[in-house]
Every structure is written in C-alpha cells, then in structure tokens.
Interface confidence: medium
Amino acid sequence: AGVFELQIHSFGPGPGPGAPRSPCSARLPCRLFFRVCLKPGLSEEAAESPCALGAALSARGPVYTEQPGAPAPDLPLPDGLLQVPFRDAWPGTFSFIIETWREELGDQIGGPAWSLLARVAGRRRLAAGGPWARDIQRAGAWELRFSYRARCEPPAVGTACTRLCRPRSAPSRCGPGLRPCAPLEDECEAPLVCRAGCSPEHGFCEQPGECRCLEGWTGPLCTVPVSTSSCLSPRGPSSATTGCLVPGPGPCDGNPCANGGSCSETPRSFECTCPRGFYGLRCEVSGVTCADGPCFNGGLCVGGADPDSAYICHCPPGFQGSNCEKRVDRCSLQPCRNGGLCLDLGHALRCRCRAGFAGPRCEHDLDDCAGRACANGGTCVEGGGAHRCSCALGFGGRDCRERADPCAARPCAHGGRCYAHFSGLVCACAPGYMGARCEFPVHPDGASALPAAPPGLRPGDPQRYL
C-alpha cells in the first residue's frame, strides 16, 4: 500500500504565439480545480476507461477575475497535494491523466457550471520511495507544471511497496538473512512469506505462500516477461531440456490479466487471480465504489456499494464517459438548419438563426412562399428577407386578410369621384372624361379617344373597374 502524490506548480499560457484568453472575466469570475486519474502499465488507454490505480480531486482554487486587457497569467491554484492512495503494489509503470477544470461562479442557473479547460496525459516509469519527479505538459496553448512521487505507507517499503517492515526484535541487529528497512534503520524487513522462488523483483505477496506478479511479468513465480513465452523460440532449446511444449502459444502468454493479476491455465482457457481492488475476467474492473465519488459533473452513481460490485454513472445531459468526465459536444451534430449557430447551454440546445429563418432549429424560412397562402386571391412575392403578399384590389395586410378601402389611394383621375363596390371600386367621371379610372378625355366632337364605348355605357357614366 502507498500514496501517489501530485503537486501542481503552475497552470498558465505556454510559450509561443497565440496566448489563450483568460478563462475568467469580470463578468464571469471563476476558480480552478484539478483531477488526476492513474492507470497501471504503459498501455495507451481511452480517456474514459476506469482509473484503475485511483483518482483524486483537488480543492477549489481561489476565485480569480481577469484584469481587463491583461494577458492570461498563471492562474491561482488550489492549496495542497493531490493524493491518490493505492492499496496494493505500486506497478512501477503507470499512465496518468491530469485535467484542469474551471468552475464558473457567475449567475448560473442551477448552481456553478464546470468546464474542462485542459487535459494532459502521459506514461511514466516511477519507483516508489524515490525523489519528486518534475514534469511539464502542454495542452493546446496552456502549460501545466507539476511534480509527482509514489511513497509507501508503513509497514510497506521498496520500489513496489511490497516488502514489509517490522520493529526490531533485538536492539542491535535484524534476524538472520533480514536487512534493515532503509530509511527506517530501526526497523527490519519482515520474514518472507511468499511462495518459495517467487521473484523478489517482480513478484509480491500479501498472504503466505502466494506469488503475485507486477505489471509486465507472469508465470507462477513472476519470472517470465509478458512479451515472451516460457519457451525462448522453436529453434531454441528442445522441449526435452526445457520441459515446455514448443507448439502454439499458451493461454497465459502475454499475460491477459491486467492490473497485476496472475494468470493460471485451465483446461480450456485461463483464470486470473486478481489483486485486491480489482475484479472481472481479466482483472480489468477496479474496486472503486460509489463512496469514492467516481462520477463527475453531477453524474448519479448507482450500485457499487462494495468493491465486489460494479458502479455505473448515470450522466446528466451534456456529459458522457464511464465517469461522466467527457463533455458531449452536441453542437458537433450540427442540429441547426440554414446556417444557424448552435449554443449548448448544458440543459438544452439553442439555435441562433440567421435573419429570414425561425424555429427551434431555424427550419422555418420566413422568406419562403412555399405553403404560405395569401388570402383573398393575393399572390406571394419573395424577397428582402420576409415573404410578402401582393393583394387583390380591396384587400391589404401581410396576408391580404384585411379589407382595404379601394378609394384610399384616390384612383379616379381628373376629379372623378370614387365609390367602393363589393367587387372593387367604381369611378364617376367628371364631365369630359371617361374610362375605368376616368383617364381618357372625351373629344369635343363627342367622339372618344377610345375606339368605342362599351355597349350600354355613355361617356360620363360611372365606370366600374373590374
């Protein structure tokens, strides 16, 4: 058992062009916090796979407000170390993810809003009990400087925290074959209780007679690297001299057991003996419980009352991943039609529509005559960002639904009098004029400029405009 410790030294803009804008503003003060996720081994794992070695969350840092016009400085950090306890052996090789989160403290509906500012990841070799290791990682325009170490919790000592120490039984020396426990010179190594022949470098035990392997080693005594089988090669020593079967790889070759589990062959397949805190066919599931608070961003933890039962995080809208640690970019689905801009408000999606469009997804074209009837015989005309109706005589308004006064525009020329009529308007022309709008002068000799007056109408009669 032991503790992995992480000390964040600074988080701020990295070198080079394109300094990031400060994540906080006077309108939107915020504070930072960090999350660390540890996984055993050097394998490249997906960001959302379980933090099998453990995870920790820092305290919130001091509230920060950007000074207007100033470049983003190194941001104020939370106090103290991030500590990730591990219950079993320290694997020696590990992967880490360190996330920098921003907590916005403005007028947020439903409490503060969290957003991931930066995520850095890496794979390292580290012996427990060694000095602090310093590191610099960059994520986009941000730079994170930090140190880390792994230390064993008494009575464990050693580079994997697998050797146990006990107080001296005699004042001057340790028992036969037992060394002093550096740096605890007043303590001695506990007598070895592992299975006889168990590799002292690559194996460990917690119970008498067992031999568990560290990451990268396999075999009953943890003496076989996972990259090779117990037989060197078909052209190597014969099976008679090595006592192994040359044909075909065995089911335990390459050690299918994760997280320090040891593999034993069964007649049909293999079986993993998992270290405490892990379970599953390949020891791939960590023994994190809901009590450890594994669900981020308001995720609801279900099950996982004890290390032998799995937990499930039910994520709130906008988040995904086994620990709800990944923000879903719902706008990446391009839900807004017709060039609308997408806003992910967390609890809902909004589309900001271009002028001329409306609707929750900007799907309605305000400039579209299709399916838009103009009433009372009007015709639809497109243009100018909004549809409009060209109305039949006697009607007006946006959709030609309003009755218009046909005489309002003074349609009768040359002093003619206008009369509203059920089918339009009628002009009573002044003497000397004729036509539907009294637009034609009557010649002095009584002849009209028109070829002929319509039957039944004399010049000067009211002309109905049809």
């Epitope: 391009q334 017709n338 060039g339 801009l341 806003l343």
Partner: antibody
Amino acid sequence: QVQLQQPGAELVRPGTSVKLSCKASGYTFTSYWMHWVKQRPGQGLEWIGVIDPSDSLANYNQEFKGKATLTVDTSSSTAYMQLSSLTSEDSAVYYCARDSTVVAPMDYWGQGTSVTVSS
Amino acid sequence: DVQITQSPSYLAASPGETITINCRASTSISKYLAWYQERPGKTNKLLIYSGSTLQSGIPSRFRGSGSGTDFTLTISSLEPEDFAMYYCQQHHVYPYTFGGGTKLEIK
C-alpha cells in the same frame, strides 16, 4: 464600401502555429458573422467555420476542430483564425468571408492569405 | 455531410453563347444553393443564393434554378468578363460544402 483585408502570405515552420487576420471595414463589424474557407492549390473550397463577432459564438466544421480556432477583436474590427500544429496539409489559401445574415450566405470575400508550411 | 457534385469541371464557350453548369446534392437541400464566381486578382463574388435569387448588382444574364438535389446556373449572352471559375455551395446545413468548381474558358 465593404472590404475585408487579409495579408497576402505567411511562411511558417511545421509544428508551429499561425494566426491569420481579416480586417473588416465599410460596415458594422458586430452585425455580420464571419466565415473562413480553405482552398488548397488546384483544389476546391472547404468551409472551416463561422463566428458571430457580437459574442464570439463559433461553429466549426468537425474536420477542422482542434486545428482552427476562430476569434475576433471588436475594437479593431478584425477576425482571426489560429491554425495549430501545422503540417504540409495546411498549406493553402485561407479566405475570410462576411455572412450577410439575411438569407444570402457569404456576400463579401477577402483576397485570401496564402499559407506555406515548410521547413 | 452533404456532398455536392458539380459538372462539368471544364467548359469552353464563345462570347454571346448561353451555357449551363449543374450541381447535384447528395441529399435534399431544399432551395439553399449559392453560386460564386472566382476571377484572378478579384475577390470571390456571390451571384445567386437560395437557388434562384439574384444577388443585388449582378446582371440578369445570370440565372439560377432548381431545388431539392438538382440545381443549374445558366449564363446567357456570355460577356468577356464571365470567363472565370464558378463554384456552387449548399447553405442549408453545416458544414457548408462546395462543388468542385467549373472552369469556363473562351473557345
């Protein structure tokens, strides 16, 4: 009259970043969205993204997420596009284009900036 | 993403002639297709949007038609300044996508 001014060319090293500018004049900068478009030599046009200068809300083509970052400086009526981790694939002409924000799309274009990524 | 296929990629014609350029969308884009003209030393020019709406200041010899998946740009009575590169672009859904272009050259 509406004008979008872009620098003619940028020569940059692989692995570095470049920030392209597009200075707008002749209209109210915050009232019109700004698009960015890529054109590789001898190839067609690719839409990168659009930004609303009034509040910096942006929408990206997924192909360019992580590659391009759109920003604006309203005090100088300038739109910017930062391209990061440059490779030879990023060598192209990059245009800014104003969105009319009525029903028409890109109604005014800049002359384009030619970016060459070379060691 | 909506794929836009533009044809032909090359076209030779004489001044005074009428030509057509076609664009086909992989899925329906309603009427939302724009046409642009690209000339060396000039900025790209918007000709037509929403399939058939003529941008202000563009001569009426440019005409757009079509809806759904098939669209056409017709240029009648070709003028010397019309010989250029033409692109269509759908502006219905993000990401906006362009056709591959048509180079119109003098015969």
